[in-house]
Structures are given as structure tokens and as C-alpha cells.
């Protein structure tokens, strides 16, 4: 009890002058409050709580229900208490059921002794099973029995109060123990597409899946840089105990060029948060864009092979490709596939491989393709490099000597003189006369060269030289001249081939 | 004996929210989950969520996921159910309940009539 | 969720008779069911929890029985008193539900 000093407010005097009391079961408690300033009696047992405003409590007939703290308040808010056992052998445990524990905690079983003289009072498993090894327990027989530092394997666990009474063992009703588990990881967030491409008027949806140890798990979906509401389905399972899952799913009906941006599926629980992200695009109508992996103007030489390479981005999916040539459409020699396997791929390769090029075979090779909003095509224009040939040498009536040559790119033609019987033609002669007679011809066929020079200009016997060349490769056409008196004879011409890198002799 | 104790009917606008409070009296509000369930007139019993026990998130069913929020005030014993986005199909009974963590309901509230018309 | 089918949905009995009220979960859950009775106006009333174990203060008329699936309520000797509906909850998980009642009338 508490001692006066006077001048200073004191608690209240509680008789009988104990801590403790205990009484039978069926006999009287009464409890006297002594205090000037008397306010109230409060009394508590488990989760209940009762008042009297009188300053004698009296309970004529004890039950086990009425163990409990008396307290007694004054005016000044100060207070004392007595706890009151009220001893029945039939019921030795008051008990609240409800038992939680949250993991890593310590959790209270509510089963307060009515005797305090009891031995042995602990914790038992249900059906004599024996408790989880780890499980540590305070006793208190005011207020039940402490497990120390709950963990998440004591879930659903059944047990009992426990208490030895007269020799005799003696059980609680049973508990089962609910742990809530405290989250130690941010959630698991995953998101069905990363991004997303529609029309306007499509239906947008996307869903986001949750995964964590409890449904208590904070989610939502929201667009960035926007404060809008956004109306999300869900779906949730519990896998099990601390196993559970999830799945956000917004929708937009009728998806608008405006909707275009990006949505966060967000959670977060009490160890922090994580979120992912989906792209949507809304485009008014489809399209096709056609990007050339080479040059549209292509130069490949005679003989050798080219591959005409496109990707082009297509939504919707393409529905028919062509590689045309010359009006006609190639039916093999082509392949078209996507880019990558992924679902949300709209980018596409186009490949036409044009093998062992003939000279004939240039011009403008065209890639078409279309879906069902738009076409789109790309032109290559193919120029086939070729040595050059000379078509025609002839001595003219009017005295010239003329060569004709052919060949890509334009071939040029260069005129030399040998005197007498010299192998090598160095003297080279000017031409009187240079046209290129097709210029405005077929725009990818050989270029046709005519060069002429005066045969007058030669006073001795020799040969003349007609040499064409270009990038590719030369040739060369011979006129034998030989001199009878005045008269200057043109003897059998003739034509060497002479290849880039080679020389050598066609008779 | 812990006693629920709901505060009074509401007449709600479709599209506007609804705010219902339930006060713990008689024991230990902490140490207890409070579960709201919600009953159309005529019709069963629909669970909307839970609150509790120790502090943490609130648990929602699928069904309101997004348009409830339960919340509790330890310093007044209270807990709180707001419905938003209001539609006459949300006219009922709202209850508050003892427990809904793993465990049955063992004491109720005595209901709130909450009535969506425009 | 787990979804619960009581049955029946009604039935009409007389005083003095033996009622059974069946509930079956659309997954196992244990014994972690309760039964509750509803009067018009009012709240529900726990009357068992854990399946089997009766809720204090409630009749002893009144038990329970079952796990896993099946759970069945039994009321040993109807009373006048005991015309309402009795809803069947699982609570094996932190989602709740309840079965879709069974409305007890006087023959």
C-alpha cells in the first residue's frame, strides 16, 4: 500500500491491504476503496473491462470469471490495484482464444491462472505432440504465457495451457497460434508485356502479377505523370501459407491516341517497394516503315552475287510481301521473318539473293509489302559492272577508223600506233571523234562507246590499237596497216581481250 | 464483454463515398483483427476485408480491391470502412466484427444501413 | 478463393426435430470453419468455430462435426428460438467466405 506525504496528492488505500487475494469459488469478494477523491474501481481480466462507480466492490458470490486486477483511481488520476484469484477446481484457466503472433515477436497466450499455488504451468502440443524444439515461453500466471520470438513454422500450431493441480496434470481449451509473417523482401512484381502497340479503338489490357508472403501487400496500377484513378480487376490465391499471389488487370476499352504512355504496376509492404513498367502506344491508323540494311543504288560486278536486304516495322502484322523485277514477281530466291521471336515484335527482314549476275540483269529491283491498313514498298536499283566488249571496228569510206565498245561503267576508249612490227603500241593517237550513243537508253543496261580517228594521220606500216577499258576489265582491237606504193590496205584486223590484272593474245 | 459499436445510417449519391466507424468498448483493441462484412438486403454475407491484428497493411477481398479502405485508430478504440465510387448495388448492411485473421468473427457490431440512390 | 456451398438453401421443420445443415468447401481446409445464426435485423451470432467446438453461451443443442471438405451443423432438437438462417465461413486463409445460407422456416 502506498505511504501518505502530506501536501502532495496520494493513491487511493485498498483494503484488505494485500497484493494478492485469493478466494474460493462461491464466496464474497469485497474490496474497499479509501480515498477522499474516490472516482472509480476498474476492473480487468484478458481482453475485458468492467467499472463501478461505488468505492466498495462487492461480488457476493466469486466465480473464476471475476479473477482478476482491481484497480482504484482517485480524482488526481493516481491509482492502486489488488488481483483477486478466485479458486475453482473445475476451471483452472481463464481463456481467451484469440492468439496471433507476429513473426520475430513475442506473442502472449491468454490463459491466466484462478489458482496461483499451481506447479508446472507451461505450454503443451495438441494430441501430446511435442512443441516445436525452438519454442521458448515465459509463464505468468496473471496474464498467461509468453512465446518468445515467434516464428513463421509455429503457424497453425495447436497447444494447450498447462498445469499440474493436486498431482493432476489439468489443460486449457486449445489455441491455435496465426502468425502473421513479416514481410523481408520488397514484393515480387512482373508485368504480362512490356510494351504494347494498338490502333485507336482497340481494347488495352494488361495485367500485373503480385507475389509476397501475405495479401496484405499494397498494389496498384498508375499512369506516370498522372494522378487519375485507374480501374484495375483482380484476382488473388493463396499458394499455401506465406505464399501468395495476385494479378492486377487494367483495361481501357477503346484505347485512344492520348492513352498512349507509360503505367507502373507499384506495391509496396512494410519493407519497401518495387514496381514495373509497360509501354503503350496508341496509333491512329497502321503503318508499315521500310528501313534498307544496304544502299538503294547497288554495284556488283558480272558474275557475282548480291543479297537486297530490308527491315521494315509493320503494324499490323504483315499480310503480303513480293520482291518484283522488270514487272515480274519473284517466287523463290527470297525469304521474309520476323526480327525476334518476342510476342510484341513488329520489325520484319525481307532478304532477295541475286546470284551470278549476267550483265543484262540490272535494274530496279522493288520490295512491296502491305497489311491491312497500308502498302509500302523500296526501290534498289542494281548495276551490273561488266568488262568492256568492242562491238565493231571498221575502216570508214570517208578514211577514219572507227571502234565500238560496250560495257559498264562506261567504258573509254583510247587509240595508240605501232610502227612496223613493235609488240607495244605507246604512241597514242587523239581521237577526231568520241559520242556515247545510248546515254539516253535503257538507264541499267552496258553503256556503248563509238570513238573514231583519221587513218590519214598514218605514214608507215604499223598496227593501230583501239584499247577500251573501265573498272572492270580491257580489251583491245588491232587494224594492220601496210603500205603498197600510195596505197595504205587495211590487213585483218583483230581483237585482244586484256582482263584487269592479265595480259595475253587472241589471234 | 468487448462490445462493437457502429455509427448510424447513411443515405449516399451514386459515385460519392461512404465512411463508417465501429468503436471497441469492454477490451484491448490492439491485440484483435476487425473484419468488415456487408450484407444486400435479402442476400448472404460478403466479407470485405480485414484489419489488424499489429500494424501492416489491411487485407481486402478481390471483389473491393481498389474501392476500400479499412483503417484504425488504436488512441480511440476505432476502426473505419470507406466504400468510394458508390453504386445502388452497394445498398446494405455493414458489419464490423471481432477477428478475421485465420479466425471467425465472435462479436459483431449492430449493422450500418448505408442506401446509394440518386 | 475458396468458394462454400451450403445446402440445403431452405428447409421447413417442426419443433422437436433433428436438423442437418451441410457445407462444402471447394477446397480442403482443415477444420478452420464457423457457424453463425442470423435473425431478421439482426447480427450474425457465432455458434460454433473450429468446426466442432461450441462458442460459450451457446446451446448445447447445437454441434458441429467435419474437416477437410464436408462440415455438417446439427441442431439436436429444434426450438421455437432457432428459426433463422445459418450461415457456414471459412477462414483457412487471410480470405474469407461465407456460404450462401440456409433458411430454417416452421413447417
Known amino acids: 500500500q502506498p505511504s501518505v506525504s502530506p501536501g502532495e496528492p496520494s493513491p487511493p488505500s485498498i483494503h484488505p491491504a494485500k497484493s494478492e487475494l485469493i478466494v474460493r469459488v462461491g464466496n464474497e469478494i469485497r474490496l474497499l476503496c479509501i480515498d477522499p477523491g474516490f472516482v472509480k474501481w476498474t476492473f480487468e481480466i484478458l481482453d475485458e473491462t468492467n467499472e463501478n462507480k461505488q468505492n466498495e466492490w462487492i461480488t457476493e458470490k466469486a466465480e473464476a470469471t471475476n479473477t482478476g486486477k482491481y484497480t482504484c483511481t482517485n480524482k488526481h488520476g493516481l491509482s492502486s490495484s489488488i488481483y483477486v484469484f478466485v479458486r475453482d477446481p473445475a476451471k483452472l484457466f481463464l481463456v481467451d482464444r484469440s492468439l496471433y503472433g507476429k513473426e520475430d515477436n513475442d506473442t502472449l497466450v491468454r490463459c491466466p491462472l484462478t489458482d496461483p499455488e499451481v506447479t508446472s504451468y507451461s505450454l503443451k502440443g495438441c494430441q501430446g505432440k511435442p512443441l516445436p524444439k525452438d519454442l521458448r515461453f515465459v509463464p505468468d500466471p496473471k496474464a498467461g504465457i509468453t512465446i518468445k520470438s515467434v516464428k513463421r513454422a509455429y503457424h497453425r500450431l495447436c497447444l494447450h495451457c498447462s498445469a499440474d493441480q493436486e498431482g493432476k496434470s489439468v489443460l486449457s481449451d486449445k489455441f491455435i497460434l496465426k502468425v502473421r509473417p513479416a514481410f523481408k523482401a520488397v514484393p515480387v512484381v512482373s508485368v504480362s508485356k512490356a510494351s504494347y502497340l494498338l490502333r485507336e479503338g482497340e481494347e488495352f489490357t494488361v495485367t500485373c502479377t503480385i507475389k509476397d508472403v501475405s495479401s496484405s501487400v499494397y498494389s496498384t496500377w498508375k499512369r506516370e505523370n498522372s494522378q487519375t484513378k485507374l480501374q484495375e480487376k483482380y484476382n488473388s490465391w493463396h499458394h499455401g501459407d506465406f505464399n501468395y499471389e495476385r494479378q492486377a488487370t487494367l483495361t481501357i476499352s477503346s484505347a485512344r491516341v492520348n492513352d498512349s504512355g507509360v503505367f507502373m504496376c507499384y506495391a509496396n509492404n512494410t519493407f519497401g517497394s518495387a514496381n514495373v513498367t509497360t509501354t503503350l502506344e496508341v496509333v491512329d491508323k497502321g503503318f508499315i516503315n521500310i528501313f534498307p540494311m544496304i544502299n538503294t543504288t547497288v554495284f556488283v560486278n558480272d558474275g557475282e552475287n548480291v543479297d537486297l536486304i530490308v527491315e521494315y516495322e509493320a503494324f499490323p502484322k504483315p499480310e503480303h510481301q513480293q520482291w518484283i523485277y522488270m514487272n515480274r514477281t519473284f517466287t523463290d530466291k527470297w525469304e521474309d521473318y520476323p526480327k525476334s521471336e518476342n510476342e510484341s515484335n513488329i520489325r520484319y527482314v525481307s532478304e532477295l539473293h541475286l546470284t551470278r549476275l549476267k550483265g543484262t540483269e540490272g535494274g530496279t529491283y522493288t520490295f512491296l509489302v502491305s497489311n491491312s491498313d497500308v502498302n509500302a514498298s523500296i526501290a534498289f536499283n542494281v548495276y551490273v559492272n561488266t568488262k568492256p566488249e568492242i562491238l565493231t571496228y571498221d575502216r570508214l569510206v570517208n578514211g577514219m577508223l572507227q571502234c565500238v565498245a560496250a560495257g559498264f561503267p562506261e567504258p573509254t576508249i583510247d587509240w595508240y600506233f605501232c610502227p612496223g612490227t613493235e609488240q607495244r603500241c605507246s604512241a597514242s593517237v587523239l581521237p577526231v571523234d568520241v559520242q556515247t550513243l545510248n546515254a539516253s537508253g535503257p538507264p541499267f543496261g552496258k553503256l556503248v562507246v563509238q570513238s573514231s580517228i583519221d587513218s590519214s594521220a598514218f605514214k608507215h606500216n604499223g598496227t593501230v590499237e583501239c584499247k577500251a577499258y573501265n573498272d572492270v576489265g580491257k580489251t583491245s582491237a588491232y587494224f594492220n596497216f601496210a603500205f603498197k606504193g600510195n596505197n595504205k590496205e587495211q590487213i585483218h584486223p583483230h581483237t585482244l581481250f586484256t582482263p584487269r590484272s592479265h595480259h595475253h593474245h587472241h589471234h | 464483454q468487448v462490445q462493437l459499436v457502429q455509427s448510424g445510417a447513411e443515405v449516399k449519391k451514386p459515385g460519392s463515398s461512404v465512411k463508417v466507424s465501429c468503436k471497441a468498448s469492454?477490451?484491448?483493441?490492439?491485440?484483435?483483427?476487425i473484419s468488415w462484412v456487408r450484407q444486400a438486403p435479402g442476400q448472404g454475407l460478403e466479407w470485405m476485408g480485414t484489419?489488424?491484428?499489429?500494424?501492416?497493411?489491411?487485407r481486402y477481398a478481390q471483389k473491393f480491391q481498389g474501392r476500400v479502405t479499412i483503417t484504425a485508430d488504436e488512441s480511440t478504440s476505432t476502426a473505419y470502412m470507406e466504400l468510394s465510387s458508390l453504386r445502388s448495388e452497394d445498398t446494405a448492411v455493414y458489419y464490423c466484427a471481432r477477428g478475421g485473421y485465420i479466425s471467425d468473427f465472435d462479436v459483431w457490431g449492430q449493422g450500418t444501413l448505408v442506401t446509394v440512390s440518386s | 478463393d475458396i468458394q462454400m456451398t451450403q445446402s440445403p438453401s431452405s428447409l421447413s421443420a417442426s419443433v422437436g426435430d433433428r436438423v442437418t445443415i451441410t457445407c462444402r468447401a471447394s477446397q480442403s481446409i482443415s477444420n478452420y470453419l464457423a457457424w453463425y445464426q442470423q435473425k431478421p435485423g439482426k447480427a450474425p451470432k457465432l455458434l460454433i468455430y473450429?468446426?466442432?467446438s461450441l462458442q460459450s453461451g451457446v446451446p448445447s443443442r447445437f454441434s458441429g462435426s467435419g474437416s477437410g471438405t464436408d462440415f455438417t451443423l446439427t441442431i439436436s432438437s429444434l426450438q421455437p428460438e432457432d428459426f433463422a438462417t445459418y450461415y457456414c465461413?471459412?477462414?483457412?486463409?487471410?480470405?474469407?467466405?461465407f456460404g450462401q445460407g440456409t433458411k430454417v422456416e416452421i413447417k
Open positions: 484489419i489488424g491484428p499489429f500494424e501492416g497493411q489491411p
Open positions: 465461413q471459412q477462414y483457412y486463409y487471410e480470405s474469407i467466405t
Open positions: 469492454g477490451g484491448t483493441f490492439s491485440s484483435y483483427a
Open positions: 473450429d468446426a466442432s
